[in-house]
């Protein structure tokens, strides 16, 4: 059947619309377009004849249409005059005419809305508020925004004149928003500049701070008042019901215990013409003495002796307190208290036993700390390290080790090679290096406070060739974008260049590519499931090169979202159903199935023989991968129509 | 109800064949791998290797790579496990378990078992 | 291929006691753990899978956990029919491997 379809249907004006013509018959003649729902020919637009390919004007041609060999009609630059209907009056080669209408209407492109009100500075639960929606627009909607959210339902908003009006009753400090309104016709949507509302309100009753209410003598005092108040409070203080000044801080320094007293703080807004008073009691104590800290043992030894700290003076009827790193005391079996809290014992010390430690003596108003104690903790040596790392020296350089042990007082070191004594030194230098000078270097730290010793013993040699290095790995199986990688070519060589190889190509350029330690590391940020390659390090010196085994870097990753296969989602009755799952992952994923939410089997594909229509619904793949931690899944629908009445799929 | 019903007990000499048969009901057989697992007598478990019937995908313990040979037969849901060269301390009980799913799954139901004597 | 370390190898306990079983695997095989009880002359029985999920039908008193290398069955109140020997199987890629197993007796 013939159809017009116009394009758009809704048209602003000065755009253009197109009429478009369906199911054209074959063996045309020629064909008319009209002005209206009828054939007029007062009220022809343009005729088309199809055999010599000309278009003639008719009355109510205007010079703006253009017709189409297939007979749509373009209307360019339209005008309001133009909505309304069009009829196509198609002539046959047998003379047999066919006719077809379409319409479609005109709107005017809206201008940019502004919003009027009635009143700008509202007083809070007293005033209301009118808001305008500027110009008033024939065949516009009107809507409203508050602070870009569409408007909440209140009983104290309401929306009048053709929702051009948003009135808002008994105005809050809350309706303190930024207002827009909007205005929409079929073909154009235009939104105000925002009006913000300035809602005078306060002030609220005040509040003083700080809140503690007690000092001792010769404290400052600081107090501060805050009101809620739109515009801001005016303050004044009162100190035993006499005015002291109009500020907002009342400061009194080296108070007594004379400065005790009611405290009030007015606040008064002078557009509300309101003022309200918050009223607080403060109380000056005398000063208390100062307590110390006295040690039965200065100098106590690691693991080996007790040291008693104990609180002064001794007060009765008084609360002491400990702090030890300015933390109260931990729960620890070596920590203990006397019955009265002023001897804090601590049993067996270890070198993180130094403190500081304080402690306090309470009063009615506050603590008084005194200065505080360190421990000076005699310990170790541990056993100490030997620097540089490397193991691997060529002939002809310099051999420069250097030894530390963490001890209390300072370690005295010693260096034997070979089990042979050489110095006393923390640092041991030997120049110019040769093979005889490989060996067992070992480096001895003594305490002379604790009478104890540590060794430790690192094996030199001094060697033109370069071992077979091989690579060590912080993290054998790491999570896709979650773990980074640390590969560090081993061993650790003096005056030696390291190198890396990719599947046997250099390291590509990559933000994610880090090399660092002299380029004997290697660290892969975030890694991904294309990380998944083999890595070799290689060393060189100017003598000779080696290169290490590949190590492959296994990726956890996944699963990825489930793809079910095939895509059919229709089927016949009496089909099999065969769907089968695939999610990319590393290790495998476990797979398993749900039917509307039922628990299924865990298999990679779901067969149902002969389904029927009771088969409908939803088939969910899940997988998941512990490895990663991550799952995913998937949901198709399936329709199964009885034999015959639809011509869907088969499996 | 999933069923796994094996083959008979066989006695074999040293150096000879062996081939154990599986056979399935109860599921949809080319969904399931099905898996071979040994103990040997007041011994633990060993696990052999896999077979997917669906595709006759296999995958073998290092241990029996070359000496076990796994197929299956659709037409008649079975899985049989074939292990050459035989020596005495192949005597066991010879299982085979289905997969409770596919990839990285324990094994849900298992065979009675087929005790195989290797003797000379 | 990762090795799968039971303890103890066998214990006993009374009716009602409280057992643990522990499982430790030579590398992460993170929550891939499955436990098999297997009673004198019968087939193994799957409990658990994934370290901690309840195979369906087996009683509540059987629990599983940990994650990584270290895993536990609990029987948490031991009853006459649970005399068996329980293995644990890491199944985190092939080859699958069981642990030696862990005898279970009523004192």
């Known amino acids: 059947k013939l159809t017009i379809e116009s394009t758009p249907f809704n048209v602003a004006e000065g755009k253009e619309v197109l009429l478009l013509v369906h199911n054209l018959p074959q063996h045309l003649f020629g064909y008319s377009w009209y002005k209206g729902e009828r054939v007029d020919g007062n009220r022809q637009i343009i005729g088309y004849v199809i055999g010599t390919q000309q278009a003639t004007p008719g009355p109510a041609y205007s010079g703006r249409e253009i017709i189409y060999p297939n007979a749509s009609l373009l209307i360019q630059n339209i005008i309001q005059n133009d909505t309304g209907f069009y009829t196509l009056h198609v002539i046959k080669s047998d003379l047999v005419n066919e006719e077809a209408t379409g319409q479609f209407r005109v709107y005017p492109e809206l201008p940019k809305p502004s919003i009027s009100s009635n009143n700008s500075k509202p007083v809070e639960d007293k005033d209301a508020v009118a808001f305008t929606c500027e110009p008033e627009t024939q065949d516009a909607t009107y809507l409203w925004w508050v602070n870009n959210q569409s408007l909440p339902v209140s009983p104290r908003l309401q929306l009048s004149n053709g929702n051009r009006t948003l009135t808002l009753f008994n105005v809050t400090r809350n309706d303190t928003a930024s207002y827009k309104c909007e205005t929409q016709n079929p073909v154009s949507a235009r939104r105000s500049d925002s009006v913000i509302l300035n809602v005078l309100y306060g002030p609220d009753a005040p509040t003083i701070s700080p809140l503690n209410t007690s000092y001792r003598s010769g404290e400052n005092l600081n107090l501060s008042c805050h009101a809620a108040s739109n515009p801001p409070a005016q303050y004044s203080w009162f100190v035993n019901g006499t005015f002291q000044q109009s500020t907002q801080e009342l400061f009194i320094p080296n108070i007594t215990v004379n400065n005790s007293g009611s405290y009030t703080c007015q606040a008064h807004n002078s557009d509300t013409g309101l003022n309200r008073t918050t009223v607080t009691t403060i109380t000056v104590y005398a000063e208390p003495p100062k307590p110390f800290i006295t040690s039965n043992n200065s100098n106590p030894v690691e693991d080996e002796d007790a040291v008693a700290l104990t609180c002064e003076p001794e007060i009765q009827n008084t609360t002491y307190l400990w702090w030890v790193n300015n933390q109260s005391l931990p729960v620890s079996p070596r920590l203990q208290l006397s019955n009265d809290n002023r001897t804090l014992t601590l049993l067996s010390v270890t070198r993180n036993d130094v403190g500081p430690y304080e402690c306090g003596i309470q009063n009615e108003l506050s603590v008084d700390h005194s200065d505080p104690v360190i421990l000076n903790v005699l310990y170790g040596p541990d056993d100490p390290t030997i620097s540089p790392s490397y193991t691997y020296y060529r002939p002809g350089v310099n051999l420069s080790l250097s030894c530390h042990a963490a001890s209390n007082p300072p370690a005295q070191y010693s260096w034997l090679i070979d089990g042979n004594i050489q110095q006393h030194t923390q640092e041991l230098f030997i120049s110019n290096i040769t093979e005889k000078n490989s060996g067992l270097y070992t480096c001895q730290a003594n305490n002379s406070a604790s009478g104890h010793s540590r060794t430790t013993v690192k094996t030199i040699t001094v060697s033109a060739e370069l071992p077979k290095p091989s690579i060590s790995s912080n993290n054998s199986k790491p999570v896709e974008d979650k773990d980074a990688v640390a590969f560090t070519c081993e061993p650790e060589a003096q005056n030696t260049t390291y190198l890396w190889w990719v599947n046997g190509q250099s390291l590509p350029v990559s933000p994610r590519l880090q090399l660092s330690n002299g380029n004997r590391t290697l660290t892969l940020f975030n890694v991904t499931r294309n990380d998944a390659r083999a890595y070799v390090c290689g060393i060189q010196n100017s003598v000779s090169a080696n290169r290490s085994d590949p190590v492959t870097l296994d990726v956890l990753y996944g699963p990825d979202t489930p793809i079910i296969s095939p895509p059919d989602s229709s089927y016949l009755s009496g089909a099999n159903l065969n769907l089968s799952c695939h999610s990319a992952s590393n290790p495998s994923p476990q797979y398993s199935w749900r039917i509307n939410g039922i628990p299924q089997q865990h298999t990679q594909v779901l067969f149902i023989a002969k389904i029927t229509p009771n088969n409908n619904g939803t088939y969910a793949c899940f997988v998941s991968n512990l490895a990663t931690g991550r799952n995913n899944s998937i949901v198709k629908s399936i329709t199964v129509s009885a034999s015959g009445t639809s011509p869907g799929l088969s499996a | 109800q999933v069923q796994l019903v094996q083959s008979g007990a066989e006695v074999k000499k040293p150096g000879a064949s062996v081939k154990v048969s599986c056979k399935a009901s109860?599921?949809?057989?080319?969904?399931?791998?099905l898996h071979w697992v040994r103990q040997a007598p007041g011994q633990g478990l060993e696990w052999i290797g896999y077979?997917?019937?669906?595709?006759?995908?296999?995958n073998y313990s290092q241990k029996f790579q070359g000496r076990a040979t796994m197929t299956a037969d659709t037409s008649t849901s079975t899985v049989y496990m074939e292990l050459s060269s035989l020596r005495s301390e192949d005597t066991a009980v010879y299982y085979c378990a289905r997969e409770y799913g596919n990839y990285n799954y324990p094994l849900d139901y298992w065979g009675q078992g087929t005790l195989v004597t290797v003797s000379s | 291929d990762i090795q799968m370390t039971q303890s103890p190898s066998s214990l006993s306990a009374s009716v009602g006691d409280r057992v643990t079983i522990t499982c430790r695997a030579s590398?992460?095989?993170?929550?891939?753990l499955a436990w098999y009880q297997q009673k004198p002359g019968k087939v193994p029985k799957l409990l658990i899978y994934n370290a901690k999920n309840l195979v369906e039908g087996v009683p509540s008193r059987f629990s599983g956990s940990g994650s990584g290398t270290d895993f536990t069955l609990t029987i948490s109140s031991l009853q006459p029919e649970d005399v068996a020997t329980y293995y644990c199987q890491h199944h985190y890629g092939t080859p699958y491997t069981f642990g030696q197993g862990t005898k279970v007796e009523i004192k």
């Open positions: 077979i997917n019937p669906n595709t006759g995908y296999t």
């Open positions: 590398e992460n095989i993170y929550g891939y």
């Open positions: 109860g599921y949809i057989f080319t969904s399931y791998w």
